[in-house]
Every structure is written in C-alpha cells, then in structure tokens.
C-alpha cells in the first residue's frame, strides 16, 4: 500500500508539472481537486512551486466555490488547503485497495491517476 | 472600529537591526494576508513582503531579500518585520496592510512608522 | 515581473475640472488593478479596486475603468480634498506586488 501511495504522490505532483502546459491532464487534476475538495499534493503551497504558474494563483478546482479567476491571487480562507494525495489516498485505502488490487498501472499511466470509474464512483458517494 | 497600529520605527546606524510590529484590530486578523509597503522620502510607494493567513506563504521584493523577515502572530493579531543589515536606502514610512487578496485590493492602512538609517 | 506606467507623472488642474490619470500594465493584468489616493503625510487611501469598483465609502465622482494593459481613473469634477497623489497597482501576478510611479494632482 505504502508503494502504491508513494507512486500516486510521484505521478500526482508530476502531472502538476504538466497542468499548465496539457489541457487534458488539467482537466483530471480539476476533477479530483473539486471532487475530493483538495488543493496540490501535500498541500496548497505545492502549486507555488511549478515553475509556470504564477506564484499568487491555484487553479480555480481548489476554490470552495468555484468560478472562472478564483484561483488568482487567493486568499487562502476561499481555498480547500488539504492536501489531494493524503485525501485520495485516505479514499483510495478505504474504498478501493480493500475492494480490488490496484496494480501500479492503475495509478501510473501516462495521464491517468485514478481510472474514471474510480472518480466516478467518489462522485456519486 | 478596523484599525492598524505600527510601533518599532526610530533611528538606526547603517548596518543595524530594528523590529517593526503591527497590532490589529476591529477584524478577524485570520481572514487577511498582511503586507509590508514603505514609501522613501519623496518617492512612490515599494512593496516590501507579504505573509499569508496562516503564515505558510512569505515572499519579499528582492532589495530586502535575506535582510528581512516577516512573521504573524494570529493568536495576538499582530504583524512584525525583522529587518537587519539595515542601509540608508531602507530610509522609509513603512506601512503595515491589510490584504484580502482576489480582486479586492489593499484596503486597510496603518498611519505607518518612521525608519531612518543614518550614521 | 509586470511593470506599471503612469501617466501624467504630475497634473494642473482647477476645482470642477474633469480628469483623467491612465495606468499601462507591461503585460495583461485583467482587471487586477487598484487605484489608491494619498494625501501628504497620511497613509494611502484604496479608492478603486478590481479596475472600475468603487471602494465603500469613496464618492461617486471617482470612477476607473479598463483591463487587460490600459486603464483610467477619472474625477469627474474636482473637489479641493482630491488634490493628492494617486497610484495604481497591480495583484494579478506577484510577487512582486507593483505600484506606478504616482501622479500628482495640483491646483492650477
């Protein structure tokens, strides 16, 4: 399980890297933020941290309330300062890893951090 | 009734240390980012640092960068500037500020205190 | 990091006067710009936020307009309290958070 974590955690803040540069992996990092209502991997400050993004923005996904621009120059009581790995993770241990095996590819592909029919399962819970 | 009150300015010989503080007032301390902004004698207003709500987010204008230090203390409701290795060009009114970010601008000002670095 | 130019750097004007002050962003800004009023001596004043919002309590004579690099604040008709210095300043990206240089408004 602690590998499996650990591989989400690496992949995750790696498709932050991307988030600004591939719509498509921004669009899934902008599903499970709002979904699972979490901002970065660790935490929000993450985002401070990719070098494209400007230093004062999270994407609008971390928002409590989203709306296009919410995201820019944030204060941090309208943003959801949780961490994604350790939420999804928390989801992840309980709902899924004791209902199937996850082999690293679930979690692991290319653009691909948790399968749609995961998130469409949390989104409907 | 919101206020900013800033203490801490006063004469200092080049090189020196000096410790500004802000206390709040009026409003939930917690819900602002807080800003440093001096104003030289005669010249235009400088940012100098924020600090976050929670105080996990800190950044400064690169003339003051590893000389000052910002730090908050919510639970007094209170706002400080360290600032050490002073130059005559750290000369200023600095004003302690009330940010809530987004769009909203810089609403509150303290009336701002003096810093003089002279030999 | 985004410069911002005002213009003019000082103004003559006469009480009932219209003016008008513009703010050039280096790079878009949308409509992340303030406009603040300062008095000699006092603390500056936040008059106009997100480009053209009338700060509470500012009187209606105020108003800005403009986004992406260009942007003004008029004073519709000049009232002897509003000969001040007036600066723009941008929270679209920072840090830095940067300010114009300040124009100042003078009776003619």
């Known amino acids: 399980r602690d590998k499996v974590m650990s591989e989400f955690n690496n992949n995750f803040r790696q498709q932050m890297e991307n988030y600004p540069k591939n719509n498509h992996t921004a669009s899934i990092l902008d599903r499970m933020q709002a979904d699972f209502k979490c901002c970065g991997a660790a935490n929000y400050t993450d985002w401070e941290k990719i070098p494209s993004m400007s230093k004062n923005r999270v994407p609008d996904s971390c928002c409590i309330n989203v709306t296009v621009g919410c995201g820019i120059n944030f204060n941090e009581k309208a943003i959801h300062k949780e961490g994604c790995v350790e939420k999804i993770g928390g989801w992840l241990r309980k709902n899924v890893l004791e209902q199937k095996l996850i082999s690293e590819e679930d979690l692991g592909g290319e653009q691909k951090l948790i399968s749609e029919e995961d998130l469409h399962h949390h989104h409907h819970h | 009734q919101v206020q900013l009150v800033e203490s801490g300015g006063g004469l200092v010989k080049p090189g020196g240390s000096l410790r500004l503080s802000c206390a709040a007032s009026?409003?939930?301390?917690?819900?602002?980012?807080m800003n440093w902004i001096r104003q030289a004698p005669g010249k235009g207003l400088e940012w100098v640092s924020y600090i976050s709500n929670s105080g996990n987010i800190l950044y400064y204008a690169d003339s003051v960068k590893g000389r000052f230090t910002i730090s908050r203390d919510n639970a007094k409701a209170s706002l400080y500037l360290q600032m050490s290795s002073l130059k005559a060009e750290d000369t200023a009114v600095y004003y302690c500020?009330?940010?809530?970010?987004?769009?909203?601008?810089?609403?509150?000002w303290g009336q701002g205190t003096t810093v003089t670095v002279s030999s | 990091d985004i410069q911002m130019t005002q213009s003019p750097s000082s103004l003559s004007a006469s009480v009932g006067d219209r003016v008008t002050i513009t703010c050039r962003a280096s790079q878009s800004i949308s409509s992340y710009l303030n406009w603040y009023q300062q008095k000699p001596g006092k603390a500056p004043k936040l008059l106009i936020y997100a480009a053209s919002s009338l700060q509470s309590g500012v009187p209606s004579r105020f108003s800005g307009s403009g986004s992406g690099t260009d942007f003004t604040l008029t004073i519709s008709s000049l009232q002897p309290e509003d000969f001040a210095t007036y600066y723009c300043?941008?929270?679209?990206?920072?840090?830095?958070?940067?300010f114009g240089q300040g124009t100042r408004l003078e009776i003619k």
């Open positions: 500020v009330r940010d809530p970010r987004m769009f909203y601008g810089m609403d509150v």
């Open positions: 300043q941008q929270s679209y990206s920072t840090p830095p958070i940067t």
């Open positions: 009026g409003f939930i301390f917690t819900d602002y980012f």
